[in-house]
């Protein structure tokens, strides 16, 4: 697994007298955003095929208004990188499409409108973990400058992110056939081969030979869909009593979404989920067809069968909405149990489990005693993600390796005196008590409540505990 990162450096008019006017004006201020679509480079896919390696949408750039009479400069860009997570191996050769979109913010009815300004494409060879590669491309009258790289997410390493690095099991060297992971010399390579037949879409592995399922899938090869609870909806914090998500008052009051759009709150504002045939901030844009490129984040656009459904977007995993414009925040449903950290990688949902827990959702309490030995006859007891040893008498410490003072716990009852002995401890009982721990009172008539003492020992003599 890893992340493809794209940095847009500049977008502006190409050189020469025929350079375009700014796409924004005083009457129509606008801002830019970018979309990137990635495909494996050597696949024989059609041009319109989905973004099999992933896709991403940038944030909106700053609002820009053209200064009358001034030449169009490079336009203000969104902050940050476009990041496309990939779950499987990095293919080395990949194809990209980068689109520059304009969002007009004028006073047109219903809010902003979107239009495609430029689109560039290419196929490149790129090793994961290498330096940023730069590119300059022209698209129509515009010129786009950008850099890109692919990097592996730990524990994956290598030019294809197919080798795993794991902490060493032995302090001095790695196992047979496995090399140290430069530059992490204290870690070792581990080959990553999932169980044969493990679903590439719905399964993954972090140990060779396993097949862990993404949320919503089950079965040994993660090919069986799981039905989900009807009460879960990505609206807000979970109710403590029901486990269901409870909506609260906020910016969606009065429903700002036009044309039958449904509103959902975001940390800063609201989002509209638009019916087919409409898009825009408030579902105000209509009459859209696939030619307008309405599907974001690598969504595949298919022409609709009737005028009211001009197009349908088939969204890649991790995105939803009629235009694939919304990233599914699957972590908001707190799927990781036992304190696991949730990571939404776009293509996959991962839980990083606390020590002592495992499984796709950290649902398994590890067999803490597996491979753990308690010395000197101690027995291992599981619990709470950490093992502990119940030590035989005379021994203590985490692994029962330390010789213990058997009298430290004051085992002799009723004022009996404790003596350490090579085989354990001996209690010298106070008058009137008997037993290995002086736990039994002697009857007033001299009869014992116990079976007769072994030959050679009288009641009241020290009872050696064997």
């Amino acid at each position: 697994a890893g992340v493809f990162e794209l940095q847009i450096h500049s977008f502006g008019p190409g050189p020469g007298p025929g350079a375009p006017r700014s796409p924004c004006s005083a009457r129509l201020p606008c801002r830019l955003f970018f979309r990137v679509c990635l495909k494996p480079g050597l696949s024989e896919e059609a041009a319109e095929s989905p973004c099999a390696l992933g896709a991403a949408l940038s944030a909106r750039g700053p609002v820009y208004t053209e200064q009358p009479g001034a030449p169009a400069p490079d336009l203000p860009l969104p902050d940050g990188l476009l990041q496309v997570p990939f779950r499987d191996a990095w293919p080395g050769t990949f194809s990209f499409i980068i689109e520059t979109w304009r969002e007009e913010l004028g006073d047109q009815i219903g809010g902003p409108a979107w239009s495609l300004l430029a689109r560039v494409a290419g196929r490149r060879r790129l090793a994961a973990g290498g330096p940023w590669a730069r590119d300059i491309q022209r698209a129509g009258a515009w010129e786009l400058r950008f850099s890109y790289r692919a990097r592996c997410e730990p524990p994956a390493v290598g030019t294809a992110c197919t080798r795993l690095c794991r902490p060493r099991s032995a302090p001095s060297r790695c196992g047979p056939g496995l090399r140290p992971c430069a530059p992490l010399e204290d870690e070792c390579e581990a080959p990553l081969v999932c169980r044969a037949g493990c679903s590439p879409e719905h399964g993954f592995c972090e140990q060779p030979g396993e097949c862990r399922c993404l949320e919503g899938w089950t079965g040994p090869l993660c090919t069986v869909p799981v039905s989900t609870s009807s009460c879960l909806s990505p609206r807000g914090p979970s109710s403590a009593t029901t486990g269901c998500l409870v909506p609260g008052p906020g910016p969606c009051d009065g429903n700002p979404c036009a044309n039958g759009g449904s509103c959902s709150e975001t940390p800063r504002s609201f989002e509209c989920t638009c019916p087919r045939g409409f898009y825009g901030l408030r579902c105000e844009v209509s009459g859209v067809t696939c030619a307008d490129g309405p599907c974001f984040n690598g969504g595949l656009c298919v022409g609709g069968a009737d005028p009211d459904s001009a197009y349908i977007c088939h969204c890649p995993p991790g995105f939803q909405g009629s235009n694939c414009e919304k990233r599914v925040d699957r972590c908001s449903l707190q799927p990781c149990r036992n304190g696991g950290l949730c990571l939404d990688l776009g293509h996959a949902l991962r839980c990083r489990c606390r020590a002592g827990f495992a499984g796709p959702r950290c649902e398994h309490d590890l067999d803490d005693c597996a491979g753990r030995a308690c010395a000197n006859g101690g027995t291992c007891v599981e619990g709470g993600g950490a093992h502990r040893c119940s030590c035989a008498l005379g021994f203590g410490g985490r692994d029962c390796r330390e010789r213990a003072d058997p009298c430290a716990a004051r085992p002799c009852a009723h004022g009996g005196r404790c003596y350490a002995h090579f085989s354990g401890l001996v209690c010298a009982c106070a008058p009137g008590y008997m037993g290995a721990r002086c736990e039994f009172p002697v009857h007033p008539d001299g009869a014992s409540a116990l079976p007769a003492a072994p030959p050679g020992l009288r009641p009241g003599d020290p009872q050696r505990y064997l």
Epitope: R134, D135, I136
Partner: antibody, heavy 117, light 107 residues
Framework: QVQLVQSGAEVKKPGASVKVSCKAS????????IHWIRQAPGQGLEWMGY????????EFNQNFKDRVTMTRDTSTSTVYMELSSLRSEDTAVYYC??????????WGQGTTVTVSS | AIQLTQSPSSLSASVGDRVTITCRAS??????LAWYQQKPGKAPKLLIY???SLEDGVPSRFSGSGSGTDFTLTISSLQPEDFATYFC?????????FGGGTKLEIK
């Protein structure tokens, strides 16, 4: 206006090296890449590689990878292309061109390199 | 490397004619195709980039079209200065590659 001016014609013996220069003017030198393209007599065009004058990053056609070197001097806005281990089939006109990855918008006038024993 | 096949390899036409030259790529190159004009003893000159974008200063009688694998350069009304050799070039993959050229001659 944008201009790329190349060095003069060269005659070389097989096994020798040739170094061709390309001096840029009329634009910000480090803003665009400089590509090298060659054309054998009566033949088509063959891309050799490019240099990014900002980073000095180079990328070459595999056909030339082991024999070509590209360098630049920002103080004079000049790019150099050196081709070693010359063979008779390297006889061609060598062009430099300004551009990005999908356009070569201005070309030098060409430098004729003749390889003959 | 991606191969580009130009046709025809040579063409005779008269001033005022409408001329079409085609370029076919060995695989999908989207719209990453440029057209260059070269006159004898001169360097090539960029006419069209990204399949249909006219370079600054190039007369509007030149136009480009196509995407994917099939592309066309059209000269709507030939002028005397248009007689030259025309090359297509793909810029989708590295290395960029050129077509074999179409020599446009006066009939």
């Amino acid at each position: 206006q944008v201009q790329l001016v190349q060095s003069g014609a060269e005659v070389k013996k097989p096994g020798a090296s040739v170094k061709v220069s390309c001096k840029a003017s009329g634009y910000h030198f480090t803003r665009y890449w400089i590509h090298w393209i060659r054309q054998a007599p009566g033949q088509g065009l063959e891309w050799m590689g490019y240099i990014n004058p900002t980073t000095v990053y180079t990328e070459f056609n595999q056909n030339f990878k082991d024999r070509v070197t590209m360098t630049r001097d920002t103080s004079t806005s000049t790019v150099y292309m050196e081709l070693s281990s010359l063979r008779s089939e390297d006889t061609a006109v060598y062009y430099c061109a300004r551009g990005g990855s999908n356009f070569f918008d201005y070309w030098g006038q060409g430098t004729t390199v003749t390889v003959s024993s | 490397a991606i191969q580009l096949t130009q046709s025809p390899s040579s063409l005779s036409a008269s001033v005022g004619d409408r001329v079409t030259i085609t370029c076919r790529a060995s695989e999908n190159i989207y719209y990453n195709l440029a057209w260059y004009q070269q006159k004898p003893g001169k360097a090539p000159k960029l006419l069209i980039y990204t399949a249909n974008s006219l370079e600054d200063g190039v007369p509007s009688r030149f136009s480009g079209s196509g995407s994917g694998t099939d592309f066309t350069l059209t000269i709507s009304s030939l002028q005397p200065e248009d007689f030259a050799t025309y090359f297509c070039k793909q810029a989708y993959d590295v290395p960029p590659t050129f077509g074999g050229g179409t020599k446009l001659e006066i009939k």
